[in-house]
Every structure is written in C-alpha cells, then in structure tokens.
Amino acid sequence: FERTRSLQDPCSNCPAGTFCDNNRNQICSPCPPNSFSSAGGQRTCDICRQCKGVFRTRKECSSTSNAECDCTPGFHCLGAGCSMCEQDCKQGQELTKKGCKDCCFGTFNDQKRGICRPWTNCSLDGKSVLVNGTKERDVVCGPSPADLSPGASSVTPPAPAREPGHSPQ
C-alpha cells in the first residue's frame, strides 16, 4: 500500500521538515526559515508561532516542530497550547472584569488562578466544622456533633489524670 500510495502521490514521501513543492514539480523542499512541518506529506510549511508580549518562549521553533509559549511571571496559561495568558491574583481572590477581587464571605480560593468556591458544608456529611474557613482556605470538617456528645467514644484519647496537689504548668 505504501508503495502504491507513493507512486500515486509523490508528496507522501516528503518527510517532516519539508513540504511538497508545486513550484518544483512536486519535489520535497526543506521548510523556509521560521516555518515548520511536523508530519510528512505536507504541501506547505506552517509559520512558526512567535511568543511576544505577555507570552514568552518555552521551546524554540524548529523546522519540524512549532514554538511553544508560556506566560511571563504574574500571568498563567489558558486554553490549548497556552493560547491565552490571564493575570494571576493572590490567594483569596478571583479575577473579575474589574481586576482581582477578594472572595466573598463563605467562599475561598487557594490558588493564584480560578474562581472563589464555596466552603464545604460540613453538615451535609453529618459533620461539624473543626477549623473555620477563610478567603484562602476551605473549612476543615471534623467528627459529627453526635461523636462529641458526652459518653460517646472520642477520637482522641483522654488526657492522663493529674496527681492531686499539682497545678498545671
């Protein structure tokens, strides 16, 4: 099949880094400067991506692979192949159209990107709040209130009894 295909289509023999040049009777030609083809059999080479402005070069373009960009400090990638850079915010904030805003009460964000999310509702799992939430951290749920009632077995062992006549240090 490969042999048949190459007889029918000479372009199928052109390797990555080249293109099938119609101006040269369909012979394979190397990609011109600042262009690439990452697969064989291409009829054109693609122009290399340029990482400009808020983008910076993570991997240089070559004749067989496109450049790869990431974002300058203070920004993070969004989209396939880092197609966009979005401003970082602080933990406890989210990015709005008006810039970085603190998370509303009852929500948190523990990253420099993304949106503020509601604190976990411990009571939905029948548990109680062990550590309160903040703008930067979710609440920590603890044992259910029933586990803390008198007579119930405690998760932590009881403190050793003090000898009489000694006050705590």
């Epitope: 880094g17 190397p30 990609c31 011109p32 400067p33 600042n34 240089e60 373009c61 070559s62 004749s63 067989t64």
Partner: nanobody
Framework: AVQLVESGGGLVQPGGSLRLSCAAS????????RSWYRQAPGKQRELVAW???????HYADSAKGRFTISRDNTKKTMYLQMNSLKLEDTAVYYC?????WGQGTQVTVSS
C-alpha cells in the same frame, strides 16, 4: 544571486565512499537552508540531505546512517560524505541553496 558548483563525483565500487563538495560564490550569508538532491535516470529529483534553517541536519530514509551533510561557512562550501555506497545511489547529485542550483556531479556505483 548565488552560484553553486559541485565536485567530487566519480565511479566507485559498492561499499565505497565519496565526498561531494558544493562551492558557493556570491552573498551566501543570508542563506539559511542548504540541501543535496539527486536524480537517477528516468526518475524524479529527490531530496537526500539538508541543513535546515535551525542548523539541524536531516536525511532522507535512503541516506540515514550512511551519508553526512556538513558545511564550512568560512570556505562557503557544503559537503556530502557518502559511505557504504549502493548500486541504487547512482545518480546526478545537485546542491541547492534556496533558489539556486548547481550543475550537478555524476556519481556511479558499479562493480
């Protein structure tokens, strides 16, 4: 325009070696892609080896492991070292620098 002149072709036995040279005259300093092609009788011209614009050497499957492309910018010369030559390597070999072609040099592999 750039003028290219190949040399180094000849008659060699199977398994032998040849070194082709391609001397350039004119302004070659902005030329970033160099390549060797060959054309066997009755066949289409084919790309054998090339130095891409990113200075990486590439080879057609038929040349991998046997041929080595190199260049010496101070001498304005490109080379193709051909080892372990086979009967099917018989062709006229052309050097190319973007839009300029040499006149070709004949390589014949025969016992």
């Amino acid at each position: 325009a750039v003028q290219l002149v190949e040399s180094g072709g000849g008659l060699v036995q199977p398994g032998g070696s040849l070194r082709l040279s391609c001397a350039a005259s004119g302004n070659i300093f902005n030329i970033r892609v160099r390549s060797w092609y060959r054309q066997a009788p009755g066949k289409q011209r084919e790309l054998v080896a090339w130095i891409a614009w990113d200075n990486v050497a590439h080879y057609a499957d038929s040349a991998k492991g046997r041929f080595t492309i190199s260049r010496d910018n101070t001498k304005k010369t490109m080379y193709l070292q051909m080892n372990s030559l086979k009967l099917e390597d018989t062709a006229v070999y052309y050097c190319n620098s973007e839009d300029s072609w040499g006149q070709g040099t004949q390589v014949t592999v025969s016992s």
